[in-house]
Protein backbone atom coordinates (compact mmCIF):
# COMPACT_ATOMS: atom_id res chain seq x y z
CA UNK A 1 0.00 0.00 0.00
CA UNK A 2 1.75 3.34 -1.09
CA UNK A 3 0.55 6.58 -0.71
CA UNK A 4 1.98 10.17 -0.85
CA UNK A 5 2.06 12.23 2.18
CA UNK A 6 -0.53 14.92 1.84
CA UNK A 7 0.39 18.51 2.67
CA UNK A 8 -1.06 18.98 6.35
CA UNK A 9 -3.51 21.47 5.09
CA UNK A 10 -4.72 18.83 2.64
CA UNK A 11 -4.98 16.44 5.62
CA UNK A 12 -6.49 18.58 7.44
CA UNK A 13 -9.23 19.50 5.46
CA UNK A 14 -9.72 16.23 4.30
CA UNK A 15 -10.19 14.52 7.67
CA UNK A 16 -13.32 14.43 9.90
CA UNK A 17 -11.41 14.34 13.27
CA UNK A 18 -7.85 15.83 13.97
CA UNK A 19 -6.84 15.58 17.53
CA UNK A 20 -3.34 15.43 19.38
CA UNK A 21 -2.98 12.14 21.46
CA UNK A 22 -1.09 9.74 23.10
CA UNK A 23 -1.22 5.87 21.99
CA UNK A 24 -1.28 4.34 25.29
CA UNK A 25 -1.42 0.15 24.55
CA UNK A 26 -0.86 -2.08 22.03
CA UNK A 27 -3.09 -2.30 19.69
CA UNK A 28 -6.19 -5.52 19.87
CA UNK A 29 -7.36 -6.99 16.75
CA UNK A 30 -10.85 -8.04 16.58
CA UNK A 31 -11.49 -11.74 15.80
CA UNK A 32 -14.37 -10.80 12.98
CA UNK A 33 -13.35 -8.10 11.29
CA UNK A 34 -9.57 -8.18 11.26
CA UNK A 35 -9.42 -4.53 12.10
CA UNK A 36 -7.34 -3.08 14.41
CA UNK A 37 -7.75 -0.80 17.51
CA UNK A 38 -5.20 1.14 19.31
CA UNK A 39 -6.26 2.70 22.95
CA UNK A 40 -5.17 6.28 22.93
CA UNK A 41 -5.17 8.86 24.95
CA UNK A 42 -6.61 12.09 23.95
CA UNK A 43 -5.45 15.72 24.80
CA UNK A 44 -6.82 17.83 22.03
CA UNK A 45 -9.22 18.28 19.70
CA UNK A 46 -8.28 20.55 16.38
CA UNK A 47 -11.48 19.82 14.37
CA UNK A 48 -14.41 17.16 14.50
CA UNK A 49 -16.63 19.33 17.46
CA UNK A 50 -19.97 18.98 15.44
CA UNK A 51 -19.04 15.91 14.05
CA UNK A 52 -18.71 14.00 17.58
CA UNK A 53 -21.23 15.80 19.36
CA UNK A 54 -21.71 14.54 22.88
CA UNK A 55 -19.11 12.42 22.61
CA UNK A 56 -15.89 14.47 22.39
CA UNK A 57 -13.96 11.76 23.73
CA UNK A 58 -11.84 9.31 21.50
CA UNK A 59 -10.66 6.60 23.16
CA UNK A 60 -9.87 4.35 20.44
CA UNK A 61 -7.97 4.69 16.54
CA UNK A 62 -9.45 1.95 13.89
CA UNK A 63 -7.04 0.52 11.49
CA UNK A 64 -6.46 -2.38 8.98
CA UNK A 65 -5.17 -5.20 10.94
CA UNK A 66 -2.80 -5.85 8.02
CA UNK A 67 -0.36 -4.02 5.20
CA UNK A 68 -1.48 -5.16 3.08
CA UNK A 69 -4.89 -3.20 3.08
CA UNK A 70 -2.89 0.07 3.76
CA UNK A 71 -3.14 -0.82 7.78
CA UNK A 72 -1.50 1.88 10.02
CA UNK A 73 1.03 0.57 12.48
CA UNK A 74 2.60 2.80 15.40
CA UNK A 75 5.92 1.90 15.96
CA UNK A 76 6.54 4.36 18.63
CA UNK A 77 6.98 2.48 22.09
CA UNK A 78 6.98 5.69 23.98
CA UNK A 79 3.58 6.36 25.89
CA UNK A 80 4.01 9.83 26.70
CA UNK A 81 4.57 11.17 23.19
CA UNK A 82 2.10 13.18 21.89
CA UNK A 83 0.91 12.42 17.76
CA UNK A 84 -1.21 14.72 15.50
CA UNK A 85 -4.07 12.02 14.19
CA UNK A 86 -5.71 13.41 10.90
CA UNK A 87 -8.48 10.91 9.98
CA UNK A 88 -12.10 9.69 9.34
CA UNK A 89 -15.22 9.51 11.28
CA UNK A 90 -17.08 5.90 10.45
CA UNK A 91 -19.75 5.08 12.53
CA UNK A 92 -18.75 7.36 15.32
CA UNK A 93 -15.21 5.51 15.21
CA UNK A 94 -12.36 7.13 14.20
CA UNK A 95 -10.14 5.22 11.20
CA UNK A 96 -7.32 5.77 10.00
CA UNK A 97 -4.73 4.04 7.15
CA UNK A 98 -1.31 4.24 5.88
CA UNK A 99 -2.20 7.50 4.00
CA UNK A 100 -3.42 9.01 6.86
CA UNK A 101 -1.79 11.85 8.35
CA UNK A 102 -0.08 10.61 11.24
CA UNK A 103 3.33 12.47 13.04
CA UNK A 104 4.86 12.71 16.19
CA UNK A 105 3.57 16.72 17.82
CA UNK A 106 7.41 17.71 18.19
CA UNK A 107 8.18 16.75 14.98
CA UNK A 108 5.62 19.68 13.57
CA UNK A 109 7.32 23.30 13.25
CA UNK A 110 5.93 25.74 14.70
CA UNK A 111 4.19 27.04 11.54
CA UNK A 112 2.50 23.85 11.39
CA UNK A 113 1.08 23.52 14.63
CA UNK A 114 0.02 26.59 14.41
CA UNK A 115 -1.99 25.53 11.37
CA UNK A 116 -3.57 22.79 12.91
CA UNK A 117 -4.70 24.23 15.86
CA UNK A 118 -5.97 27.52 14.12
CA UNK A 119 -5.23 28.47 10.07
CA UNK A 120 -5.27 25.65 8.23
CA UNK A 121 -9.57 25.75 8.35
CA UNK A 122 -9.70 28.85 6.67
CA UNK A 123 -8.56 27.61 3.40
CA UNK A 124 -10.53 24.46 3.77
CA UNK A 125 -13.89 26.25 2.68
CA UNK A 126 -12.76 27.64 -0.82
CA UNK A 127 -8.56 26.57 -1.46
CA UNK A 128 -7.07 23.30 -2.70
CA UNK A 129 -3.59 22.23 -2.48
CA UNK A 130 -2.61 21.60 -5.50
CA UNK A 131 0.10 18.55 -6.22
CA UNK A 132 2.31 19.29 -8.79
CA UNK A 133 4.28 15.84 -9.34
CA UNK A 134 5.96 16.64 -12.82
CA UNK A 135 7.07 19.77 -14.84
CA UNK A 136 5.25 21.58 -16.33
CA UNK A 137 2.12 21.74 -14.65
CA UNK A 138 -0.49 25.16 -14.12
CA UNK A 139 -2.72 26.29 -11.92
CA UNK A 140 -6.33 25.11 -13.00
CA UNK A 141 -8.18 27.82 -10.90
CA UNK A 142 -7.22 30.38 -9.09
CA UNK A 143 -8.41 28.98 -5.76
CA UNK A 144 -5.25 26.33 -6.04
CA UNK A 145 -2.12 26.92 -4.78
CA UNK A 146 0.46 25.13 -6.67
CA UNK A 147 2.53 22.45 -4.41
CA UNK A 148 6.01 21.99 -5.55
CA UNK A 149 7.59 20.39 -2.69
CA UNK A 150 7.75 16.58 -4.28
CA UNK A 151 9.72 17.77 -7.40
CA UNK A 152 12.53 19.21 -4.90
CA UNK A 153 12.48 16.82 -1.48
CA UNK A 154 10.68 14.28 -0.09
CA UNK A 155 6.81 16.21 0.27
CA UNK A 156 6.28 15.95 4.29
CA UNK A 157 9.68 17.64 4.28
CA UNK A 158 9.22 20.82 2.17
CA UNK A 159 9.56 24.51 2.51
CA UNK A 160 5.49 24.78 1.75
CA UNK A 161 4.35 21.62 3.54
CA UNK A 162 6.42 23.22 6.80
CA UNK A 163 5.66 26.85 6.64
CA UNK A 164 2.74 28.10 4.18
CA UNK A 165 -0.60 27.86 3.81
CA UNK A 166 -3.46 28.19 1.14
CA UNK A 167 -5.60 31.13 1.88
CA UNK A 168 -8.12 33.20 1.10
CA UNK A 169 -6.46 36.68 -0.30
CA UNK A 170 -9.48 37.75 -2.09
CA UNK A 171 -12.81 36.34 -3.45
CA UNK A 172 -11.42 33.48 -5.94
CA UNK A 173 -8.32 33.88 -5.13
CA UNK A 174 -5.93 31.80 -2.85
CA UNK A 175 -2.07 32.10 -2.64
CA UNK A 176 0.32 30.59 -0.37
CA UNK A 177 0.85 32.54 3.01
CA UNK A 178 3.46 31.72 5.55
CA UNK A 179 2.44 30.72 8.66
CA UNK A 180 5.56 31.89 10.88
CA UNK A 181 4.83 35.46 10.55
CA UNK A 182 1.43 34.34 11.96
CA UNK A 183 2.82 32.94 14.87
CA UNK A 184 2.37 35.06 18.22
CA UNK B 1 -17.50 -28.20 21.97
CA UNK B 2 -15.83 -25.84 19.16
CA UNK B 3 -14.79 -28.41 16.55
CA UNK B 4 -13.19 -28.22 13.04
CA UNK B 5 -13.76 -30.73 10.66
CA UNK B 6 -11.89 -30.89 7.04
CA UNK B 7 -12.58 -32.45 3.79
CA UNK B 8 -11.56 -32.72 0.62
CA UNK B 9 -8.15 -33.89 0.19
CA UNK B 10 -6.99 -36.28 -1.90
CA UNK B 11 -4.33 -36.87 -4.85
CA UNK B 12 -4.52 -34.95 -7.47
CA UNK B 13 -1.84 -34.74 -10.57
CA UNK B 14 0.37 -30.96 -11.22
CA UNK B 15 -2.03 -28.21 -12.65
CA UNK B 16 -5.08 -30.20 -11.60
CA UNK B 17 -7.94 -28.40 -8.96
CA UNK B 18 -9.08 -29.38 -5.53
CA UNK B 19 -11.49 -28.32 -3.41
CA UNK B 20 -11.60 -27.94 0.81
CA UNK B 21 -14.12 -28.09 2.66
CA UNK B 22 -14.26 -27.25 6.33
CA UNK B 23 -17.62 -27.68 8.78
CA UNK B 24 -17.37 -25.46 12.08
CA UNK B 25 -19.59 -26.92 15.04
CA UNK B 26 -19.64 -25.36 18.73
CA UNK B 27 -19.20 -21.41 18.52
CA UNK B 28 -20.60 -18.56 16.47
CA UNK B 29 -18.80 -19.09 13.19
CA UNK B 30 -19.71 -15.52 11.85
CA UNK B 31 -17.89 -14.00 14.22
CA UNK B 32 -14.56 -15.62 13.97
CA UNK B 33 -11.81 -14.70 11.01
CA UNK B 34 -10.69 -18.24 9.52
CA UNK B 35 -7.86 -19.56 8.00
CA UNK B 36 -6.30 -21.83 6.23
CA UNK B 37 -2.76 -23.26 7.38
CA UNK B 38 -0.72 -26.03 5.57
CA UNK B 39 2.21 -28.12 6.70
CA UNK B 40 4.63 -30.52 4.19
CA UNK B 41 5.63 -33.56 5.14
CA UNK B 42 8.60 -33.36 8.12
CA UNK B 43 8.22 -29.34 7.55
CA UNK B 44 6.74 -26.72 10.10
CA UNK B 45 3.73 -24.74 9.78
CA UNK B 46 3.05 -21.75 6.68
CA UNK B 47 0.14 -19.81 7.09
CA UNK B 48 -1.53 -20.23 3.65
CA UNK B 49 -5.11 -17.51 3.95
CA UNK B 50 -7.34 -16.11 6.29
CA UNK B 51 -10.87 -14.61 5.74
CA UNK B 52 -12.74 -12.10 7.42
CA UNK B 53 -15.88 -13.24 9.68
CA UNK B 54 -18.36 -11.65 6.89
CA UNK B 55 -16.20 -12.90 3.87
CA UNK B 56 -15.69 -9.56 2.92
CA UNK B 57 -12.06 -9.52 3.04
CA UNK B 58 -9.40 -12.16 1.96
CA UNK B 59 -5.86 -12.56 3.03
CA UNK B 60 -3.22 -14.48 1.04
CA UNK B 61 0.55 -15.67 1.26
CA UNK B 62 2.08 -15.02 -1.54
CA UNK B 63 3.04 -18.39 -2.27
CA UNK B 64 -0.64 -18.96 -3.32
CA UNK B 65 -1.76 -15.88 -4.18
CA UNK B 66 -3.75 -15.75 -7.37
CA UNK B 67 -4.30 -19.90 -7.27
CA UNK B 68 -5.99 -20.44 -4.17
CA UNK B 69 -9.19 -18.49 -3.25
CA UNK B 70 -10.78 -18.35 -0.05
CA UNK B 71 -14.23 -18.20 0.88
CA UNK B 72 -17.19 -19.30 3.54
CA UNK B 73 -20.66 -19.49 3.95
CA UNK B 74 -21.68 -18.61 6.88
CA UNK B 75 -25.55 -20.37 6.74
CA UNK B 76 -24.01 -23.84 6.43
CA UNK B 77 -20.88 -22.67 8.70
CA UNK B 78 -18.71 -23.62 6.35
CA UNK B 79 -15.14 -22.47 5.30
CA UNK B 80 -13.28 -23.31 1.72
CA UNK B 81 -10.22 -23.18 0.08
CA UNK B 82 -10.31 -23.48 -4.00
CA UNK B 83 -6.35 -24.86 -4.95
CA UNK B 84 -6.62 -24.31 -8.84
CA UNK B 85 -2.84 -24.75 -10.83
CA UNK B 86 -1.43 -27.08 -8.09
CA UNK B 87 2.20 -27.76 -7.80
CA UNK B 88 4.30 -30.38 -6.13
CA UNK B 89 5.24 -27.90 -3.60
CA UNK B 90 1.48 -27.40 -2.42
CA UNK B 91 1.64 -31.11 -1.35
CA UNK B 92 0.70 -30.55 2.97
CA UNK B 93 -1.65 -31.90 5.68
CA UNK B 94 -3.90 -28.51 5.51
CA UNK B 95 -5.35 -27.40 8.66
CA UNK B 96 -8.74 -25.02 9.06
CA UNK B 97 -7.98 -22.75 12.52
CA UNK B 98 -10.34 -20.36 13.94
CA UNK B 99 -8.79 -16.46 14.09
CA UNK B 100 -5.69 -17.63 16.78
CA UNK B 101 -6.54 -20.74 18.58
CA UNK B 102 -9.14 -23.91 17.76
CA UNK B 103 -7.22 -26.15 14.57
CA UNK B 104 -9.15 -28.90 12.85
CA UNK B 105 -7.17 -32.32 12.38
CA UNK B 106 -6.49 -31.69 9.01
CA UNK B 107 -6.95 -33.32 5.48
CA UNK B 108 -3.96 -34.24 3.52
CA UNK B 109 -3.47 -33.19 0.01
CA UNK B 110 -0.87 -34.81 -2.59
CA UNK B 111 0.81 -33.56 -5.94
CA UNK B 112 1.95 -35.85 -7.90
CA UNK B 113 2.00 -36.77 -11.87
CA UNK C 1 9.82 -18.23 4.75
CA UNK C 2 10.35 -18.74 9.09
CA UNK C 3 9.63 -15.61 10.52
CA UNK C 4 10.41 -16.65 14.28
CA UNK C 5 13.33 -17.88 15.25
CA UNK C 6 13.05 -21.04 17.67
CA UNK C 7 16.01 -23.73 18.99
CA UNK C 8 16.23 -26.81 17.07
CA UNK C 9 16.13 -28.94 19.34
CA UNK C 10 16.29 -28.78 23.70
CA UNK C 11 16.19 -31.55 25.78
CA UNK C 12 15.66 -32.16 29.37
CA UNK C 13 15.56 -34.96 32.38
CA UNK C 14 12.10 -36.11 33.60
CA UNK C 15 10.95 -33.62 36.55
CA UNK C 16 13.13 -30.28 35.08
CA UNK C 17 12.46 -27.41 33.56
CA UNK C 18 12.72 -26.36 29.76
CA UNK C 19 12.08 -23.11 28.12
CA UNK C 20 11.86 -22.28 24.42
CA UNK C 21 12.16 -18.90 22.85
CA UNK C 22 10.36 -17.58 19.58
CA UNK C 23 12.18 -14.17 18.50
CA UNK C 24 10.47 -12.38 15.93
CA UNK C 25 10.09 -8.41 15.61
CA UNK C 26 8.20 -5.02 16.45
CA UNK C 27 5.55 -6.14 14.18
CA UNK C 28 4.79 -9.50 15.12
CA UNK C 29 5.87 -10.95 18.83
CA UNK C 30 6.76 -6.96 19.90
CA UNK C 31 3.68 -5.60 18.40
CA UNK C 32 0.73 -7.54 19.83
CA UNK C 33 0.17 -9.73 22.61
CA UNK C 34 -0.76 -12.67 20.32
CA UNK C 35 1.54 -15.43 20.59
CA UNK C 36 0.43 -19.19 20.96
CA UNK C 37 2.28 -22.24 20.99
CA UNK C 38 1.64 -25.35 20.03
CA UNK C 39 2.48 -28.91 20.99
CA UNK C 40 2.45 -31.80 17.82
CA UNK C 41 2.93 -35.10 18.41
CA UNK C 42 3.95 -37.17 15.35
CA UNK C 43 1.69 -37.66 12.57
CA UNK C 44 -1.09 -35.86 14.62
CA UNK C 45 -2.47 -32.02 14.16
CA UNK C 46 -1.03 -28.92 16.47
CA UNK C 47 -2.40 -28.45 19.61
CA UNK C 48 -3.11 -25.63 21.57
CA UNK C 49 -1.23 -25.52 24.50
CA UNK C 50 -0.61 -21.47 25.35
CA UNK C 51 -2.65 -18.54 23.58
CA UNK C 52 -2.71 -14.84 24.09
CA UNK C 53 1.22 -14.57 25.34
CA UNK C 54 0.60 -16.64 28.79
CA UNK C 55 -2.91 -17.98 29.11
CA UNK C 56 -4.11 -21.58 28.69
CA UNK C 57 -6.82 -23.30 27.32
CA UNK C 58 -8.73 -25.31 29.55
CA UNK C 59 -7.37 -28.87 29.94
CA UNK C 60 -3.82 -27.99 29.51
CA UNK C 61 -1.65 -28.89 32.66
CA UNK C 62 -0.25 -25.65 34.45
CA UNK C 63 2.94 -26.86 33.62
CA UNK C 64 3.07 -24.89 30.88
CA UNK C 65 3.77 -21.40 30.87
CA UNK C 66 3.77 -18.64 28.57
CA UNK C 67 5.56 -15.08 28.55
CA UNK C 68 7.14 -12.10 26.80
CA UNK C 69 9.73 -9.92 26.39
CA UNK C 70 10.01 -7.66 23.86
CA UNK C 71 10.47 -8.98 20.49
CA UNK C 72 11.19 -12.55 22.44
CA UNK C 73 8.25 -14.86 23.39
CA UNK C 74 9.18 -18.08 25.63
CA UNK C 75 7.46 -21.14 26.39
CA UNK C 76 8.25 -23.21 29.94
CA UNK C 77 7.23 -26.51 30.76
CA UNK C 78 8.07 -27.57 34.38
CA UNK C 79 8.15 -30.93 35.66
CA UNK C 80 9.34 -32.46 32.61
CA UNK C 81 7.12 -35.70 31.88
CA UNK C 82 7.73 -37.98 28.82
CA UNK C 83 4.51 -37.25 27.24
CA UNK C 84 5.80 -33.73 27.02
CA UNK C 85 8.39 -35.53 24.33
CA UNK C 86 6.91 -33.56 21.08
CA UNK C 87 7.45 -30.51 18.22
CA UNK C 88 6.31 -26.96 19.70
CA UNK C 89 5.88 -24.59 17.62
CA UNK C 90 5.60 -20.58 18.43
CA UNK C 91 2.87 -18.83 16.33
CA UNK C 92 2.09 -14.98 16.18
CA UNK C 93 -0.14 -12.15 14.95
CA UNK C 94 1.72 -10.52 12.02
CA UNK C 95 0.99 -7.05 10.85
CA UNK C 96 2.76 -7.91 7.22
CA UNK C 97 1.47 -11.40 6.54
CA UNK C 98 -1.41 -12.09 8.96
CA UNK C 99 0.33 -15.47 10.84
CA UNK C 100 3.80 -16.15 11.52
CA UNK C 101 5.11 -19.26 12.66
CA UNK C 102 8.67 -20.59 14.56
CA UNK C 103 10.67 -23.51 12.60
CA UNK C 104 9.60 -25.75 15.65
CA UNK C 105 11.73 -26.65 18.38
CA UNK C 106 12.05 -30.86 18.94
CA UNK C 107 12.19 -31.20 22.73
CA UNK C 108 13.52 -34.35 23.77
CA UNK C 109 13.29 -35.69 27.50
CA UNK C 110 16.02 -37.80 28.26
CA UNK C 111 15.85 -41.47 30.60
Known amino acids: CTCVPPHPQTAFCNSDLVIRAKFVGTPEVNQTTLYQRYEIKMTKMYKGFQALGDAADIRFVYTPAMESVCGYFHRSHNRSEEFLIAGKLQDGLLHITTCSFVAPWNSLSLAQRRGFTKTYTVGCEECTVFPCLSIPCKLQSGTHCLWTDQLLQGSEKGFQSRHLACLPREPGLCTWQSLRSQIA | QVQLVESGGGLVQPGGSLRLSCAASGFTFSSYAMSWVRQAPGKGLEWVSAISGSGGSTYYADSVKGRFTISRDNSKNTLYLQMNSLRAEDTAVYYC??????WGQGTLVTVSS | DIALTQPASVSGSPGQSITISCTGT?????????VSWYQQHPGKAPKLMIY???NRPSGVSNRFSGSKSGNTASLTISGLQAEDEADYYC??????????FGGGTKLTVLG
Open chain 3, 91 to 100: QSYDFKTYLV
Open chain 2, 97 to 102: ARFLDI
Open chain 3, 26 to 34: SSDVGGYNY
Open chain 3, 52 to 54: DVS
